[in-house]
Amino acid sequence: YDFTNCDFEKIKAAYLSTISKDLITYMSGTKSTEFNNTVSCSNRPHCLTEIQSLTFNPTAGCASLAKEMFAMKTKAALAIWCPGYSETQINATQAMKKRRKRKVTTNKCLEQVSQLQGLWRRFNRPLLKQQ
Protein backbone atom coordinates (compact mmCIF):
# COMPACT_ATOMS: atom_id res chain seq x y z
CA TYR A 1 0.00 0.00 0.00
CA ASP A 2 1.20 3.50 -0.87
CA PHE A 3 0.72 5.75 2.17
CA THR A 4 1.36 8.97 0.22
CA ASN A 5 -2.26 10.15 0.28
CA CYS A 6 -2.99 9.62 3.97
CA ASP A 7 -4.23 12.45 6.17
CA PHE A 8 -0.98 12.63 8.14
CA GLU A 9 -2.10 15.32 10.57
CA LYS A 10 -5.14 13.31 11.68
CA ILE A 11 -3.04 10.19 12.10
CA LYS A 12 -0.53 12.21 14.10
CA ALA A 13 -3.30 13.56 16.35
CA ALA A 14 -4.66 10.06 16.94
CA TYR A 15 -1.17 8.85 17.77
CA LEU A 16 -0.49 11.66 20.23
CA SER A 17 -3.87 11.35 21.97
CA THR A 18 -4.29 7.60 22.14
CA ILE A 19 -1.91 5.21 20.38
CA SER A 20 1.17 6.60 22.12
CA LYS A 21 -0.45 5.99 25.52
CA ASP A 22 -1.18 2.37 24.60
CA LEU A 23 2.41 1.85 23.49
CA ILE A 24 3.60 3.26 26.82
CA THR A 25 1.23 0.92 28.67
CA TYR A 26 2.64 -2.04 26.74
CA MET A 27 6.18 -0.98 27.60
CA SER A 28 5.47 -0.27 31.28
CA GLY A 29 8.26 -1.51 33.51
CA THR A 30 10.82 -1.24 30.70
CA LYS A 31 13.57 1.40 30.79
CA SER A 32 13.44 3.77 27.83
CA THR A 33 17.19 3.22 27.28
CA GLU A 34 16.95 -0.57 27.27
CA PHE A 35 16.71 -0.94 23.49
CA ASN A 36 18.59 0.76 20.67
CA ASN A 37 16.54 2.00 17.74
CA THR A 38 17.70 0.11 14.66
CA VAL A 39 14.72 0.76 12.36
CA SER A 40 14.40 4.18 10.79
CA CYS A 41 12.27 5.99 8.22
CA SER A 42 12.87 8.97 5.98
CA ASN A 43 9.46 10.57 5.46
CA ARG A 44 5.87 10.14 6.59
CA PRO A 45 4.74 7.58 3.98
CA HIS A 46 7.91 5.58 4.61
CA CYS A 47 7.35 5.77 8.38
CA LEU A 48 3.80 4.44 8.00
CA THR A 49 5.09 1.62 5.80
CA GLU A 50 7.57 0.61 8.51
CA ILE A 51 4.98 1.07 11.27
CA GLN A 52 2.52 -1.16 9.43
CA SER A 53 5.15 -3.82 8.89
CA LEU A 54 6.38 -3.89 12.50
CA THR A 55 2.85 -3.79 13.93
CA PHE A 56 1.10 -6.38 11.79
CA ASN A 57 3.74 -8.75 10.39
CA PRO A 58 4.83 -11.53 12.77
CA THR A 59 8.58 -11.69 13.33
CA ALA A 60 10.81 -14.35 14.85
CA GLY A 61 10.20 -14.25 18.58
CA CYS A 62 7.21 -11.91 18.40
CA ALA A 63 4.06 -13.00 16.60
CA SER A 64 1.50 -11.37 18.85
CA LEU A 65 1.59 -7.59 18.40
CA ALA A 66 -1.27 -7.45 15.91
CA LYS A 67 -3.71 -8.40 18.66
CA GLU A 68 -2.68 -5.62 21.04
CA MET A 69 -4.82 -2.56 21.72
CA PHE A 70 -2.33 -0.17 20.08
CA ALA A 71 -2.39 -2.33 16.94
CA MET A 72 -6.18 -2.22 16.70
CA LYS A 73 -6.13 1.57 17.03
CA THR A 74 -3.30 1.83 14.49
CA LYS A 75 -5.28 -0.25 12.00
CA ALA A 76 -8.33 1.92 12.62
CA ALA A 77 -6.37 5.12 12.02
CA LEU A 78 -4.83 3.85 8.77
CA ALA A 79 -8.19 2.54 7.56
CA ILE A 80 -10.01 5.79 8.31
CA TRP A 81 -7.41 8.26 7.07
CA CYS A 82 -5.58 6.43 4.28
CA PRO A 83 -7.85 6.18 1.21
CA GLY A 84 -8.28 2.59 0.04
CA TYR A 85 -6.20 1.11 2.85
CA SER A 86 -8.94 -1.19 4.12
CA GLU A 87 -9.38 -2.62 0.63
CA THR A 88 -5.78 -3.85 0.62
CA GLN A 89 -6.19 -5.82 3.85
CA ILE A 90 -8.11 -8.80 2.47
CA ASN A 91 -5.46 -11.46 2.99
CA ALA A 92 -2.88 -9.76 5.16
CA THR A 93 -4.43 -10.44 8.54
CA GLN A 94 -6.19 -13.68 7.62
CA ALA A 95 -2.88 -15.31 6.75
CA MET A 96 -1.48 -14.92 10.25
CA LYS A 97 -4.66 -15.23 12.30
CA LYS A 98 -3.99 -18.83 13.34
CA ARG A 99 -0.57 -17.89 14.75
CA ARG A 100 -1.64 -14.94 16.84
CA LYS A 101 -2.36 -14.98 20.54
CA ARG A 102 -2.42 -12.00 22.87
CA LYS A 103 -0.54 -11.65 26.14
CA VAL A 104 2.77 -13.27 25.21
CA THR A 105 4.99 -10.29 26.02
CA THR A 106 8.46 -11.53 25.15
CA ASN A 107 11.61 -9.44 25.31
CA LYS A 108 11.62 -9.52 21.51
CA CYS A 109 8.13 -7.99 21.47
CA LEU A 110 9.23 -5.26 23.88
CA GLU A 111 12.16 -4.50 21.60
CA GLN A 112 9.84 -4.37 18.59
CA VAL A 113 7.44 -1.98 20.34
CA SER A 114 10.41 0.19 21.30
CA GLN A 115 11.27 0.35 17.59
CA LEU A 116 7.65 1.28 16.87
CA GLN A 117 7.82 4.13 19.34
CA GLY A 118 10.88 5.43 17.53
CA LEU A 119 9.16 5.20 14.15
CA TRP A 120 6.11 7.05 15.44
CA ARG A 121 8.31 9.78 16.95
CA ARG A 122 10.03 10.15 13.59
CA PHE A 123 6.62 10.26 11.83
CA ASN A 124 5.69 13.19 14.08
CA ARG A 125 8.82 15.17 13.13
CA PRO A 126 8.92 14.91 9.33
CA LEU A 127 11.06 18.01 8.82
CA LEU A 128 14.00 16.73 10.87
CA LYS A 129 16.99 15.68 8.83
CA GLN A 130 17.68 11.93 8.81
CA GLN A 131 20.41 11.08 11.33
Partner: antibody, heavy 121, light 108 residues
Framework: QVQLQQSGAELVRPGSSVKISCKAS????????VNWVKQRPGQGLEWIGQ????????DYNGKFKGKATLTADKSSSTAYMQLSSLTSEDSAVYFC??????????????WGQGTSVTVSS | EIVLTQSPALMAASPGEKVTITCSVS???????LHWYQQKSETSPKPWIY???NLASGVPVRFSGSGSGTSYSLTISSMEAEDAATYYC?????????FGGGTKLEIK
Protein backbone atom coordinates in the same frame (compact mmCIF):
# COMPACT_ATOMS: atom_id res chain seq x y z
CA GLN B 1 -25.71 10.15 7.64
CA VAL B 2 -24.23 7.21 9.47
CA GLN B 3 -26.73 4.53 10.47
CA LEU B 4 -26.56 1.03 11.92
CA GLN B 5 -29.81 -0.84 11.35
CA GLN B 6 -30.22 -4.07 13.28
CA SER B 7 -32.48 -7.02 12.54
CA GLY B 8 -35.73 -7.55 14.42
CA ALA B 9 -36.51 -9.29 17.70
CA GLU B 10 -36.00 -13.05 17.92
CA LEU B 11 -37.79 -15.68 20.00
CA VAL B 12 -35.74 -18.86 19.93
CA ARG B 13 -35.64 -22.29 21.60
CA PRO B 14 -32.99 -23.35 24.13
CA GLY B 15 -30.12 -25.16 22.46
CA SER B 16 -30.68 -23.52 19.10
CA SER B 17 -28.70 -20.76 17.35
CA VAL B 18 -29.59 -17.31 16.14
CA LYS B 19 -27.86 -14.92 13.74
CA ILE B 20 -28.52 -11.22 14.07
CA SER B 21 -27.47 -8.55 11.63
CA CYS B 22 -26.28 -4.95 11.67
CA LYS B 23 -26.52 -3.15 8.32
CA ALA B 24 -24.30 -0.09 8.02
CA SER B 25 -24.88 2.92 5.79
CA UNK B 26 -23.49 6.42 5.37
CA UNK B 27 -19.80 5.50 5.68
CA UNK B 28 -17.11 3.20 4.28
CA UNK B 29 -18.06 -0.05 6.03
CA UNK B 30 -14.72 -1.79 5.54
CA UNK B 31 -12.75 0.98 7.27
CA UNK B 32 -14.30 0.82 10.74
CA UNK B 33 -14.38 -1.83 13.44
CA VAL B 34 -17.85 -2.98 14.48
CA ASN B 35 -18.36 -3.78 18.16
CA TRP B 36 -21.06 -5.95 19.73
CA VAL B 37 -22.43 -5.35 23.22
CA LYS B 38 -24.86 -7.39 25.34
CA GLN B 39 -27.39 -6.00 27.81
CA ARG B 40 -29.52 -8.34 29.90
CA PRO B 41 -32.88 -6.99 31.14
CA GLY B 42 -32.30 -4.41 33.87
CA GLN B 43 -28.55 -5.03 33.75
CA GLY B 44 -25.43 -3.26 32.54
CA LEU B 45 -23.42 -3.42 29.33
CA GLU B 46 -21.05 -6.24 28.42
CA TRP B 47 -18.60 -6.16 25.51
CA ILE B 48 -18.77 -9.30 23.35
CA GLY B 49 -16.16 -8.52 20.72
CA GLN B 50 -15.40 -6.63 17.54
CA UNK B 51 -14.77 -7.28 13.87
CA UNK B 52 -12.84 -5.32 11.25
CA UNK B 53 -14.73 -5.83 7.98
CA UNK B 54 -11.67 -4.89 5.90
CA UNK B 55 -10.10 -8.30 6.50
CA UNK B 56 -12.40 -10.13 8.91
CA UNK B 57 -10.04 -9.67 11.87
CA UNK B 58 -11.81 -10.28 15.19
CA ASP B 59 -11.25 -9.78 18.90
CA TYR B 60 -13.46 -11.55 21.44
CA ASN B 61 -14.15 -11.21 25.11
CA GLY B 62 -12.98 -14.61 26.39
CA LYS B 63 -16.33 -15.05 28.10
CA PHE B 64 -18.06 -15.18 24.70
CA LYS B 65 -15.59 -17.38 22.80
CA GLY B 66 -17.54 -20.38 21.56
CA LYS B 67 -20.81 -18.56 22.19
CA ALA B 68 -20.59 -15.70 19.69
CA THR B 69 -19.19 -15.76 16.16
CA LEU B 70 -18.67 -12.43 14.38
CA THR B 71 -18.64 -12.13 10.61
CA ALA B 72 -19.01 -9.34 8.07
CA ASP B 73 -20.11 -9.11 4.46
CA LYS B 74 -18.51 -6.16 2.70
CA SER B 75 -20.74 -6.47 -0.37
CA SER B 76 -23.84 -5.71 1.69
CA SER B 77 -22.12 -3.59 4.38
CA THR B 78 -23.53 -5.89 7.03
CA ALA B 79 -22.01 -7.27 10.21
CA TYR B 80 -23.41 -10.44 11.76
CA MET B 81 -23.28 -12.09 15.13
CA GLN B 82 -24.26 -15.73 15.54
CA LEU B 83 -25.05 -17.00 19.03
CA SER B 84 -25.01 -20.75 19.54
CA SER B 85 -26.24 -23.29 22.13
CA LEU B 86 -28.67 -20.73 23.50
CA THR B 87 -29.80 -20.73 27.12
CA SER B 88 -31.89 -18.34 29.19
CA GLU B 89 -28.65 -16.51 30.08
CA ASP B 90 -28.46 -15.41 26.45
CA SER B 91 -31.81 -13.60 26.64
CA ALA B 92 -30.77 -9.98 26.19
CA VAL B 93 -30.68 -6.98 23.90
CA TYR B 94 -27.64 -7.01 21.62
CA PHE B 95 -26.22 -3.80 20.19
CA CYS B 96 -23.75 -3.19 17.39
CA UNK B 97 -21.65 -0.02 17.53
CA UNK B 98 -19.07 1.55 15.25
CA UNK B 99 -15.55 2.02 16.58
CA UNK B 100 -13.92 5.26 15.55
CA UNK B 101 -11.77 8.20 16.52
CA UNK B 102 -13.75 11.03 18.06
CA UNK B 103 -11.69 14.17 18.66
CA UNK B 104 -8.66 11.87 18.43
CA UNK B 105 -9.92 9.53 21.17
CA UNK B 106 -10.87 6.02 20.18
CA UNK B 107 -14.31 4.75 21.18
CA UNK B 108 -17.72 4.03 19.73
CA UNK B 109 -19.89 6.69 18.17
CA UNK B 110 -22.94 5.31 16.33
CA TRP B 111 -24.97 2.46 17.83
CA GLY B 112 -27.65 0.26 16.35
CA GLN B 113 -31.13 0.30 17.90
CA GLY B 114 -30.58 -3.11 19.48
CA THR B 115 -31.92 -6.59 18.77
CA SER B 116 -33.89 -8.37 21.49
CA VAL B 117 -33.24 -12.11 21.75
CA THR B 118 -35.54 -14.14 23.99
CA VAL B 119 -34.67 -17.77 24.69
CA SER B 120 -37.72 -19.72 25.77
CA SER B 121 -39.25 -23.13 25.29
CA GLU C 1 -9.41 -7.93 33.06
CA ILE C 2 -9.82 -4.33 34.18
CA VAL C 3 -12.78 -3.90 36.52
CA LEU C 4 -14.67 -0.59 36.61
CA THR C 5 -16.69 0.10 39.75
CA GLN C 6 -19.24 2.91 39.63
CA SER C 7 -20.77 4.64 42.59
CA PRO C 8 -23.41 5.23 43.55
CA ALA C 9 -25.42 2.58 41.70
CA LEU C 10 -28.59 4.62 42.16
CA MET C 11 -29.16 8.23 43.09
CA ALA C 12 -31.78 10.94 42.90
CA ALA C 13 -31.10 14.64 42.53
CA SER C 14 -33.25 17.73 42.62
CA PRO C 15 -33.31 20.20 39.72
CA GLY C 16 -30.37 22.57 40.05
CA GLU C 17 -28.40 20.23 42.29
CA LYS C 18 -24.76 19.36 41.57
CA VAL C 19 -24.26 15.66 40.79
CA THR C 20 -21.04 13.63 40.80
CA ILE C 21 -20.72 10.02 39.65
CA THR C 22 -17.45 8.17 40.17
CA CYS C 23 -15.76 5.36 38.29
CA SER C 24 -12.99 3.47 40.07
CA VAL C 25 -10.64 1.44 37.86
CA SER C 26 -8.93 -1.71 39.15
CA UNK C 27 -5.60 -0.84 37.52
CA UNK C 28 -4.26 2.47 36.29
CA UNK C 29 -5.20 3.49 32.73
CA UNK C 30 -4.49 6.48 30.53
CA UNK C 31 -7.17 9.17 30.75
CA UNK C 32 -7.47 9.00 26.96
CA UNK C 33 -8.99 5.52 27.32
CA LEU C 34 -11.85 6.30 29.72
CA HIS C 35 -15.23 7.19 28.22
CA TRP C 36 -18.76 7.78 29.51
CA TYR C 37 -22.07 6.81 27.90
CA GLN C 38 -25.62 7.87 28.67
CA GLN C 39 -28.52 5.44 28.26
CA LYS C 40 -32.19 6.14 28.66
CA SER C 41 -34.62 3.24 29.06
CA GLU C 42 -35.34 1.20 25.94
CA THR C 43 -32.79 3.08 23.83
CA SER C 44 -29.20 2.62 22.70
CA PRO C 45 -26.34 4.07 24.76
CA LYS C 46 -25.08 7.44 23.54
CA PRO C 47 -21.44 8.55 23.69
CA TRP C 48 -21.34 11.27 26.32
CA ILE C 49 -17.74 12.01 27.30
CA TYR C 50 -14.60 10.83 25.48
CA UNK C 51 -11.09 10.63 26.86
CA UNK C 52 -12.15 11.52 30.42
CA UNK C 53 -13.14 15.13 29.78
CA ASN C 54 -14.17 15.76 26.16
CA LEU C 55 -17.90 16.21 25.65
CA ALA C 56 -19.48 14.41 22.70
CA SER C 57 -21.41 16.44 20.17
CA GLY C 58 -24.64 17.88 21.55
CA VAL C 59 -23.85 17.20 25.21
CA PRO C 60 -24.79 20.20 27.39
CA VAL C 61 -21.89 22.12 28.92
CA ARG C 62 -23.25 21.51 32.42
CA PHE C 63 -21.60 18.08 32.08
CA SER C 64 -17.90 17.66 32.73
CA GLY C 65 -15.50 14.82 33.31
CA SER C 66 -12.22 14.52 35.15
CA GLY C 67 -9.78 12.05 36.62
CA SER C 68 -6.61 10.09 36.01
CA GLY C 69 -5.01 6.76 36.85
CA THR C 70 -7.62 4.74 38.72
CA SER C 71 -10.15 7.42 39.66
CA TYR C 72 -12.56 9.15 37.28
CA SER C 73 -15.75 11.14 37.64
CA LEU C 74 -18.63 12.65 35.69
CA THR C 75 -20.17 15.83 37.08
CA ILE C 76 -23.38 17.70 36.30
CA SER C 77 -23.11 21.25 37.58
CA SER C 78 -26.87 21.77 37.76
CA MET C 79 -29.23 18.82 37.40
CA GLU C 80 -32.03 19.04 34.86
CA ALA C 81 -34.94 16.66 34.24
CA GLU C 82 -33.53 15.52 30.89
CA ASP C 83 -30.36 14.31 32.63
CA ALA C 84 -32.26 11.47 34.30
CA ALA C 85 -30.68 8.35 32.77
CA THR C 86 -28.16 5.60 33.43
CA TYR C 87 -24.50 6.53 32.97
CA TYR C 88 -21.76 4.00 32.21
CA CYS C 89 -18.00 4.40 32.19
CA UNK C 90 -15.95 2.24 29.81
CA UNK C 91 -12.25 1.57 29.33
CA UNK C 92 -10.44 1.14 26.01
CA UNK C 93 -7.06 0.42 27.58
CA UNK C 94 -6.92 -3.37 27.39
CA UNK C 95 -8.93 -6.38 26.29
CA UNK C 96 -11.55 -7.33 27.11
CA UNK C 97 -13.15 -3.91 26.96
CA UNK C 98 -15.16 -3.40 30.11
CA PHE C 99 -17.95 -1.16 31.37
CA GLY C 100 -18.80 0.01 34.85
CA GLY C 101 -21.99 -1.38 36.36
CA GLY C 102 -23.84 1.84 35.67
CA THR C 103 -25.27 4.66 37.77
CA LYS C 104 -28.99 5.24 37.50
CA LEU C 105 -29.69 8.93 38.04
CA GLU C 106 -33.26 9.95 38.81
CA ILE C 107 -34.88 13.34 39.22
CA LYS C 108 -36.48 14.18 42.55
Amino acid sequence: QVQLQQSGAELVRPGSSVKISCKASGYTFSSYWVNWVKQRPGQGLEWIGQIYPGDGDTDYNGKFKGKATLTADKSSSTAYMQLSSLTSEDSAVYFCARGTYYNNYYGTDYWGQGTSVTVSS
Amino acid sequence: EIVLTQSPALMAASPGEKVTITCSVSSSISSSNLHWYQQKSETSPKPWIYGTSNLASGVPVRFSGSGSGTSYSLTISSMEAEDAATYYCQQWSSYPLTFGGGTKLEIK
